[in-house]
Amino acid sequence: APRGTQAEESPFVGNPGNITGARGLTGTLRCQLQVQGEPPEVHWLRDGQILELADSTQTQVPLGEDEQDDWIVVSQLRITSLQLSDTGQYQCLVFLGHQTFVSQPGYVGLEGLPYFLEEPEDRTVAANTPFNLSCQAQGPPEPVDLLWLQDAVPLATAPGHGPQRSLHVPGLNKTSSFSCEAHNAKGVTTSRTATITVLPQQPRNLHLVSRQPTELEVAWTPGLSGIYPLTHCTLQAVLSDDGMGIQAGEPDPPEEPLTSQASVPPHQLRLGSLHPHTPYHIRVACTSSQGPSSWTHWLPVETPEGVPLGPPENISATRNGSQAFVHWQEPRAPLQGTLLGYRLAYQGQDTPEVLMDIGLRQEVTLELQGDGSVSNLTVCVAAYTAAGDGPWSLPVPLEAWRPGQAQPVHQLVKEPSTPAFSWPWW
């Protein structure tokens, strides 16, 4: 029968030793057994469980010429990059005949400098704004005490006496560095150094100061920027139609914004080259040497209507007896608003001017009072919006109507029964 089949007689002549070290350690556990006959396969146990995918070796050396003589078997188990999960009790196990033999245990322990599970991260914060930093370390050995440092200066008299996992900073007025030291019985480990960059606070109270059809004057109140003066502020404006959906928190508009920079102070800016009678959304951010603040929420604004920038086009005026036919086309120049209608003025030599509101029609027939012999009759037309009248056209003389000349379809506009060339009647 193979050696070691009696329960009281173990085949193991060398048992696993102990390994204690820091994270990352590479170590080897060994066991040796002497058996008679065919050498068995050696298995490794950790805390009583077989390690299925162990990185192991096995050497078998015969002690005699005959296969039935004794063999020395050496098994080695590699622990690569020691972690907490590798710690525990290790044993070798062999099956010999109908019996199972287990070696004496060896122990693998983790003991070294503290190991960081969480370290402070770089971040940006607004001036004088509270924030938290996190740091977490573990042994073994425990306990692990933390000591926070700001700009390399300890924030407590000794490790474990100040804040531990979370450091609450009520606010900063200058860019600072933070790190934490983890102390245990083995020594000290220092975390990475986090840079906390102090940016200006978000500007407040963005509002309109004045409105013109093509420009808006806006102002805002700057936020605190710590020890760093503001270098400039940036204003963005974007066209907004009703369906655009810029909400208070929506990060970016769907189209390229118009961007303007403002020297500061004053915290005011005139935005020009805008479209009249158009809704916009505007926002502002201010910058110091450390970087820009966050943007304000989008503020909806609207440019007011302006007057049309040009007169109606292609005015023609013809006269046939006591009737005058006048027609025109919409101004080619921008209307700067919603066209509400046209005003027409006509005047004869040495007679007062007559003003009429034609509405949105682009033609009119005038019933002239009297014998129609008034000389040098001229007509002017202007377009208007809610903001007022645009420029008048140049005077157009009434030409005599010639047979065969097309006459526009029109609706007669008769002057009321008042003397010819009366003052406006609208």
């Epitope: 696993p16 590479t26 170590g27 060994r30 162990a54 070796t57 096995q58 050497t59 590699r78």
Partner: antibody, heavy 121, light 107 residues
């Protein structure tokens, strides 16, 4: 007598593949770890990876992970280094080496006591 | 990865001189340090393992010492066959890493 003999080196284009062999004799092939170490021309030594031929458990350096594969055939007492997606910076003499087995119930670390003659890639 | 920094990178010495090469680890590696000798066109040879243990067949003029982060290889009386490049190697953590080498030349 312990011996390790590498073969399979040669000239290869970037992106190409090559398989190196390391034939072992004179010791228990399953009783240790076989390491691959390389040395770029005029430079120092760089570890590539290891394998325990017994458990066929490889471990790699980050610089070759995903491109190189280490394997072993215990019936031939041979370890292999399959190199794919080769780069100019992989140019080196490649050595296989036997890990020196310390004694006692445990040890930390290891050393390499027998080395092959090297093969140039 | 642990960095191993050897100094000096080269030195000139005469036969019979006592030569000391140092190796510094970027973190504690206990005694998991080996020293190798390499001659041009040849494979490295193991001299010292576990920081201070002389490998079988290596002349006793070679010795190693140190633990933690600072290690030393000493050749008590330099011989003509000792002119070579020497490397330290840590194996405390994976990957094992080597020093950049120290070339010992004839003065």
């Amino acid at each position: 007598e312990v011996q390790l003999v590498e073969s399979g080196g040669g000239l290869v284009q970037p992106g190409g593949s090559l398989r190196l062999s390391c034939a072992a004799s004179g010791f228990s092939f399953t009783g240790t770890w076989i390491h691959w170490v390389r040395q770029a021309p005029g430079k120092g030594l760089e570890w590539v990876g290891w394998i325990a031929p017994y458990s066929r458990h490889p471990y790699y350096a980050d610089s070759v992970k995903g491109r190189f594969t280490i394997s072993a055939d215990t019936s031939k007492n041979t370890a292999y280094l399959q190199m794919n997606s080769l780069r100019a910076e992989d140019t080196a003499v490649y050595y296989c080496a036997r890990e020196y087995s310390g004694w006692g119930g445990s040890s930390v670390g290891y050393a390499m006591d027998y080395w092959g003659q090297g093969t140039l890639v | 990865d642990i960095q191993m920094t050897q100094s000096p990178s080269s030195l000139s010495a005469s036969v019979g001189d006592r030569v000391t090469i140092t190796c510094r680890a970027s973190q504690d590696v206990s005694t998991a340090v080996a020293w190798y000798q390499q001659k041009p066109g040849k494979a490295p040879k193991l001299l010292i393992y576990s920081a201070s243990f002389l490998y079988s067949g290596v002349p006793s003029r070679f010795s190693g010492s140190g633990s933690g982060t600072d290690f030393t290889l000493t050749i008590s009386s330099l011989q003509p066959e000792d002119f070579a490049t020497y490397y330290c190697q840590q194996s405390y953590t994976t990957p094992p890493t080597f020093g950049q080498g120290t070339k010992v030349e004839i003065k």
